[in-house]
């Protein structure tokens, strides 16, 4: 259905944008509180959205040092913004078998951001691999 695939595309474009925000934050990793955070890795199929919400819930924080505090806080806020709802996301919400956030290995900000980026890339890869060829506006 065209409008639902367009909605999915818009959703994945949002994921694409999140990768750039993660990359931006990686530049300021020394200005983040060096706290260990749950960082899902090798997420099992159908638990991607659950893992995604774990990354969003994590308490990534600026160390409030230097003049990078504003850009860091804005970037973190954007990472936590809820993406538009999709059928895939709704379906996965009903899965009770996905690991809880606390069960994932905790990692410092650098590895946390790298794993977040890997998950986002995996979700985009799944989306683009599962649909017919054509542009995001087709």
């Amino acid at each position: 259905h065209k409008s639902s695939s367009q909605g999915q595309d818009r959703h994945m474009i949002r994921m694409r944008q999140l990768i750039d925000i993660v990359d931006q934050l990686k530049n300021y990793v020394n200005d983040l509180v060096p706290e260990f955070l749950p960082a899902p890795e090798d997420v099992e199929t159908n638990c991607e959205w659950s893992a995604f919400s774990c990354f969003q819930k994590a308490q990534l924080k600026s160390a409030n040092t230097g003049n990078n505090e504003r850009i860091i806080n804005v970037s973190i806020k954007k990472l936590k913004r809820k993406p538009p709802s999709t059928n895939a996301g709704r379906r996965q919400k009903h899965r009770l078998t996905c690991p809880s956030c606390d069960s994932y290995e905790k990692k410092p900000p650098k590895e946390f951001l790298e794993r977040f980026k890997s998950l986002l890339q995996k979700m985009i890869h799944q989306h683009l691999s599962s649909r017919t060829h054509g542009s995001e506006d087709s």
């Epitope: 818009r10 474009i13 694409r16 542009s135 506006d137």
Partner: antibody, heavy 116, light 107 residues
């Protein structure tokens, strides 16, 4: 259809600033980030940075940090790129490009010439 | 920054020829590789995104393949309107970077 229309050519003196505009139409303006890319005469493409039109969040290339400012006028669906402290090496064609999964639509380019 | 090395930098070919352009990244870019076409005085056009996805309106004679660090753009049967400069671009990591370009000229 998606269209990005840029402002006309500019001639500037070294040390001056230039502000290039890019007016978007044919899609939901705030759904897509806008990137800026430049191309010096006879050279390849160089990424300058990006802006999210929904909240003016920016990411700039380290090569231009401190000299480039990207802004948005949501009421006219226009993105602006201002480059300050111009030098002769900034002579180039400047492009805006909408970003979905890639830079899927580009403006026609704006030639900026820096000459004393 | 991720470096992209395109080869060849230029090539001469005839209408109907099969043309292959390669792009090598300095690190694994996980298929986040796009191809663009540029003609003098015209807007840059996206041809292929995410290694092999054809952008809307792009003729099927254009195709892309690759993985890891090595990627290829193929034009199966060169048409008169295909004489242009082609660029690869990685979307894996900021900053966005482009290859040096490949100019396809008429033999």
């Amino acid at each position: 259809q998606v269209q990005l229309v840029q402002s006309g050519a500019e001639v500037k003196k070294p040390g001056a600033s230039v502000k290039v505009s890019c007016k978007a139409s044919g899609y939901t303006f705030t759904d897509y980030w806008m990137h800026w890319v430049r191309q010096a005469p006879g050279q390849g493409l160089e990424w300058m940075g990006t802006i999210d039109p929904s909240d003016q969040y920016t990411i700039y290339s380290q090569n231009f940090k401190g000299r480039v400012t990207m802004t948005v006028d949501e009421s006219t669906s226009t993105v602006y790129m201002e480059l300050s402290s111009l030098r002769s090496e900034d002579t180039a064609v400047y492009y805006c490009a909408r970003y979905g999964f890639a830079m899927d639509y580009w403006g026609q380019g704006t030639l900026v010439t820096v000459s004393s | 920054d991720i470096q992209l090395t395109q080869s060849p930098s230029s090539l001469s070919a005839s209408v109907g020829d099969r043309v292959t352009i390669t792009c090598r990244a300095s690190q694994d870019i996980s298929n986040f590789l796009n191809w663009y076409q540029q003609k003098p005085g015209k807007a840059v056009k996206l041809l292929i995104y995410y290694t092999s996805r054809l952008h809307s309106g792009v003729p099927s004679r254009f195709s892309g393949s690759g993985s890891g660090t090595d990627y290829t753009l193929t034009i199966s049967s060169l048409q008169p309107e295909d004489f242009a400069t082609y660029y690869c671009q990685q979307g894996h990591t900021l900053p966005r970077t482009f290859g040096g370009g490949t100019k396809v000229e008429i033999k």
